[in-house]
């Protein structure tokens, strides 16, 4: 038995309004009803959770009212979008993959999606 | 799946020692860094130690009173810990978590990356 795998892009840059999206894909070894999926940034020897959301197969993901993160699921394919970033967000952003129920649990992590986030040049004033 | 299920635990004296051992079933240990966590009453669990197949990392407040060690053959992880303290009071968890490239001596303890999870055991430090 290995950790589950998962599999999310090497690199994404953020749009000009601060907004990355990625797939995170797992390989579920059984038939899992209910998956928590969260997104995890480590940058400068420090881990915080991005956000969390939890799922039942089938439905919509779920994430709190006031999350900078959305999403959609498809199968084992979770869509993730995160907004809001700015470019001292840079980082590493890790799909942490949990399969809930029904037992037994599973656990897999991906490589991580280094995102780059360059904030946006203001325009300079216009004479006209 | 992968299960874990710790022993050792137990009373002992301020300055004493205690072996906590962890049995890892289900996998061997290389795929995955197994820690060592506590939760005292009323507090947050937070890391304690933990070790991969070539390294090892630990909490400040145990550097050098602690010592992680992994048995391959058994499957097996220890938490030696010495000159125990009455904050060292605490439910003992071993976890395991995926082994990762990007973990970092200062990420590979890092709660967020488990899921595995033993039961507990209690440790108390009498003064």
């Known amino acids: 038995c290995k950790a589950m795998h998962v599999a999310q892009p090497a690199v994404v840059l953020a749009s000009s309004r601060g907004i990355a999206s990625f797939v995170c894909e797992y390989a579920s070894p059984g038939k899992a009803t209910e998956v928590r999926v969260t997104v995890l940034r480590q940058a400068d020897s420090q881990v915080t959770e991005v956000c969390a959301a939890t799922y039942m197969m089938g439905n919509e993901l779920t994430f709190l009212d006031d999350s900078i993160c959305t999403g959609t699921s498809s199968g084992n394919q979770v869509n993730l979008t995160i907004q809001g970033l700015r470019a001292m967000d840079t980082g590493l952003y890790i799909c942490k993959v949990e399969l809930m129920y029904p037992p037994p649990y599973y656990l897999g992590i991906g490589n991580g999606t280094q995102i780059y986030v360059i904030d946006p040049e203001p325009c300079p004033d216009s004479d006209f | 799946q992968v299960q874990l299920v710790e022993s050792g635990g137990g009373l002992a004296q301020s300055g004493g020692s205690l072996r906590l051992s962890c049995a890892v079933s289900?996998?061997?240990?290389?795929?995955?860094?197994i820690g060592w966590f506590r939760q005292a009453p009323g507090k947050e669990r937070e890391t304690v130690s933990c070790?991969?197949?070539?390294?090892?990392s630990y909490a400040d407040g145990v550097k050098g009173r602690f010592t992680i060690s992994r048995d391959t053959a058994k499957n097996m992880v220890y938490l030696q810990m010495n000159s125990l303290k009455p904050e060292d009071t605490a439910v003992y968890y071993c976890?395991?978590?995926?082994?990762?490239?990007?973990?970092?001596?200062?990420?590979?303890?890092?709660?967020?990356?488990?899921?595995?999870w033993a039961q507990g055991t209690l440790v108390t430090v009498s003064s």
């Open positions: 976890a395991a978590s995926p082994d990762k490239a990007f973990y970092t001596d200062q990420t590979m303890c890092n709660i967020h990356y488990y899921g595995y």
């Open positions: 289900g996998s061997t240990l290389d795929p995955f860094v």
């Open positions: 070790i991969n197949r070539n390294r090892a």
